[in-house]
Interface confidence: low
């Protein structure tokens, strides 16, 4: 899928929301110039795109909801890529210019006489994208136009800042929650010296910059720290972990705050490498309990303890997805595509230049089989439902006592919708309540997953803990057999009685060497030996000194001993 | 069951030219695996000399191996080892192995192997 | 490239007795030690991978042990059908590269 022609998908309604799925994999190094979009995702992009029509039939069936007023969307492809998304919301903001336009009699024909052309409808609202970095560039546009956006996934701590992201709002909390429960694991277990690695862009270089922060006021040291990009190629991941393996044995811990593709080109490489087993990997909630992540490298990803926002699943999405067959599904316009990348087939009736697959699709084929919800699924449907009772509240104070769209609504107003935005709580779809802070951000809670083998040949996520607003509990027994197993992850060891640390120059503070004090030397703190006074000497625990006892000869006393050097 | 079998042994001439063709059955070749090549000079030790991934068909080799070995991919159940200038010092039997990384995990499958004789 | 050395190169023991085989890498290869089993006319069969685990269907007799560049594999309760020639196989992550060691014949009395 090329720059030249983007498909989108349409639903009608007498409101329009605008969302941002990732349908495509992010473009190649080789094609980003011509933001050639990748192969098509089932979790991230077809889900998202089916739970968007299917919410808005919910909704739209809802006699409390909206009354009388039918939600429509315009699903566009992100590509989990600026440039991508930047393109469509233009398409967004260009549907609106034109309505607005429209609306106050500009739109004139050639001629000069006015025109019954009757345009798109404009995006009231945004829901998406789920990239930091991506969802940066979009607000960055549709807040020039007023236009909200509420994001699903999009958890940097930038864009707390409303100074700058006014029309930014999101139902999942921002990365400096997360970044304090990974300090917190590392801590639990007594890891002092880790090594960082983060994807380059947004999402990972704030949360990194959080994490190395608590870390540094936790006396956590951080032995290197690397960055990389999701879609760099092999010899950069290579490289990547040739460094990692030089800080081995001390740093077997290597916090990841990464996208999903990052962690899985890492467990790549120690695949290629020949590397697993070697390091413990503490990932953030773009690994969380992603099976794309780990597929086919189950034994590199051993260990991993990930943080994952906590989402149940949604019963009544699967029921409808999973009954989703291509002859019948055509709102979706990318159904077809992912149908036959997804069974790798060629469906009948598709144009065979188009297809890769020769194998003919069998007619039994099923979405049930190896069915995974996407695991962000409840926050997407969430961000759906809060545009509509931001709606639904907005139309109940321009309109009181009218069902349905009344003039003080038409256009709608992008400003007194945020507002009722962010004034917005209501019981989500897993029971929990969805309410706004004065960030536009949403409450903390966590799993912590821990990804382990089963049996033979059989690996799977745990829930092996939860961090909810900054209290951490884990399930020790659970994540480590044996309390001997618990991995170390430290530079040095603690000294001996009577021996202080000696931190080497240039090397970080959990780095030292431990050196005996003197003979007549005192431990005085963790740094520094002292020198008893004359007349006194060092207690047996070398923590203080104590008087030496005078001891005065009396006649009568044996002569004391002496022996000259040339005694042997 | 799964099963290797190498073929395109025999005798051939010093600086000549062979190819090695190594058929998977019984496996989903498709998937992680990586298969790789080993020669074991009659009454002497085992000796690697290269890998290919499945997945990507990245090769991997020994130093010794390079720009003589070339291995690759050539359908989806065969891969093969090219063998150029050879000497009598390349005559061994030469077994194709899967394993699950370039040597991390060992090769858990072999095949019976092929016997290339150096002669003139 | 990574040298792998294998000692002894050959050892002799009586049924039921133990031998033990020590294969050392020329550079730490970490976990990344495998131990195969040959018998003439055979290719070779994997025993242990990653230096400690042992293959499915392989006995528990046999027992792998050591990481970095010391490497152990311990045959105990040897049977006739352990006569055989023992090779290690060493990966070194940093070249990619394997190395197998020279050999160990077991003999069985």
């Known amino acids: 899928q090329s720059s030249e022609r983007r498909v989108v998908a349409h639903m009608p309604g007498d409101i329009i929301i605008g969302a941002l799925f990732s349908v495509h994999h992010q473009p190649t190094v080789d094609k980003v110039h011509e933001r050639k979009c990748g192969a098509v995702r089932e979790q991230y992009g077809i889900q998202r795109v089916e739970a968007m029509l299917h919410t808005l039939e919910r909704i739209n069936s809802d006699p409390t909801l909206l009354p009388n007023i039918t939600l429509g969307c315009e699903i566009r492809d992100s590509c989990w890529h600026s440039a991508v998304a930047l393109e469509q919301s233009i398409e967004f903001i260009r549907d609106s210019l034109i309505s607005s336009e429209e609306e106050e009699g500009l739109v004139r024909c050639v001629d000069g006489s006015s025109s019954s052309f009757r345009s798109k409808k404009p995006i009231v609202g945004v829901i998406g994208p789920g990239s930091s970095s991506v969802a940066i560039q979009v607000q960055n546009l549709l807040q020039l136009f007023n236009i909200p956006q509420i994001a699903y996934s999009a958890t940097s701590m930038d864009l707390s800042d409303k100074t700058l992201f006014k029309y930014f709002m999101r139902v999942v909390p921002s990365d400096a929650q997360q970044a304090r429960a990974m300090v917190d694991i590392v801590k639990r277990y007594n890891w002092t010296y880790v090594s960082a690695v983060h994807t380059e862009g947004n999402y990972g270089e704030s949360g990194m910059e959080a994490f190395k922060d608590m870390s540094a006021k936790e006396g956590i040291c951080i032995a290197h720290s690397y960055k990389i990009y999701s879609n760099a190629g092999e010899q950069s991941f290579d490289k990547l972990l040739k460094k990692l393996t030089s800080h081995l044995p001390k740093a077997r811990v290597v916090a990841c705050f990464c996208e999903g593709m990052t962690v899985r080109g890492l467990l790549m490489a120690m695949r290629r490498l020949g590397l697993a087993g070697e390091f413990l990997l503490l990932g953030s909630d773009g690994w969380a309990d992603r099976y794309d992540v780990t597929d086919g490298y189950q034994r590199e990803a051993v260990g991993g303890i990930t943080i994952k926002l906590q989402s149940p699943d949604v019963k009544w999405f699967d029921d409808y997805y999973l009954k989703l067959r291509p002859e019948t599904n055509h709102r979706n316009p990318w159904f077809q595509e992912f149908w036959q990348h997804r069974f790798q087939c060629r469906l009948e009736g598709f144009p065979q230049e188009n297809s890769k697959y020769n194998k003919t699709c069998d007619s039994s084929l099923t979405l049930k089989t190896h069915h995974v919800q996407d695991s962000k699924m409840g926050f997407v449907i969430n961000a759906i439902y809060s545009m509509a009772y931001g709606l639904h509240n907005m139309q109940m104070s321009l309109c009181p006592g009218y069902a349905g769209l009344c003039d003080a609504m038409k256009p709608i107003d992008g400003r007194k919708l945020l507002e009722s935005l962010m004034k917005t709580n209501f019981t989500g779809v897993s029971g929990d309540m969805i309410l706004f802070d004065e960030n536009g951000d949403s409450p903390g809670r966590y799993e912590i997953m821990n990804f382990k083998e089963m049996g033979k040949d059989y690996f799977d996520y745990i829930n092996v803990g939860s961090w909810d607003n900054g209290e951490l509990k884990m399930d020790d027994d659970e994540v480590w057999s044996k309390k001997s197993n618990i991995i170390r992850s430290v530079c040095s060891e603690p000294c001996e009685k009577g021996q202080i640390k000696v931190i080497r120059k240039g090397e970080v503070s959990c780095c030292w060497t431990c050196t005996p004090c003197k003979e007549n030397e005192y431990v005085f703190d963790e740094y520094t030996c002292k020198a008893c006074q004359l007349g006194s000497w060092p207690t047996d625990d070398l923590t203080g000194c104590d008087l030496i006892p005078v001891q005065y000869l009396r006649w009568g006393d044996p002569e004391p001993d002496y022996k000259d050097d040339d005694d042997k | 069951q799964q099963q290797l079998e190498e073929s395109g042994g025999g005798l051939v001439k010093p600086g000549g030219t062979l190819t090695l063709t190594c058929k998977v059955s019984?496996?989903?070749?498709?998937?992680?695996?990586?298969m790789c090549w080993v020669r074991q000079a009659p009454g002497k030790g085992l000796e690697w000399i290269a890998c290919?991934?499945?997945?990507?068909?990245?090769t991997y080799y020994a130093s010794w191996a390079k720009g003589r070995f070339t291995s690759s991919k050539t359908s989806s159940t065969t891969v093969t080892l090219q063998m150029t200038s050879l000497t009598a010092a390349d005559t061994a039997t030469y077994f194709c192995?899967?394993?699950?990384?370039?040597?991390?995990?060992?090769?858990?499958?072999w095949g019976p192997g092929t016997l290339v004789t150096v002669s003139s | 490239d990574i040298v792998m050395t294998q000692t002894p190169a050959s050892v002799e023991a009586a049924v039921g007795g133990t031998v033990t085989i020590k294969c050392q890498a020329s550079?730490?290869?970490?976990?990344?030690l495998a131990w195969y089993q040959q018998k003439p006319g055979q290719p070779p069969k994997l025993l242990i991978y990653?230096?400690?685990n042992l293959e499915s269907g392989v006995p528990s007799r046999f027992k792998g042990s050591g990481s970095g560049t010391e490497f152990t594999l311990t045959i105990s309760d040897l049977e006739c059908a352990d006569a055989a020639t023992y090779y290690c196989?060493?990966?070194?992550?940093?070249?990619?590269?394997?190395?197998f060691g020279g050999g160990t014949e077991v003999v069985v009395k």
């Open positions: 192995a899967r394993g699950s990384g370039v040597g991390s995990y060992g090769y858990s499958l």
């Open positions: 019984g496996i989903d070749f498709s998937s992680y695996y990586y």
């Open positions: 290919i991934y499945a997945g990507d068909g990245g």
């Open positions: 990653r230096a400690s």
């Open positions: 550079e730490s290869i970490y976990s990344n």
């Open positions: 196989q060493g990966y070194y992550a940093s070249t990619t590269t394997n190395a």
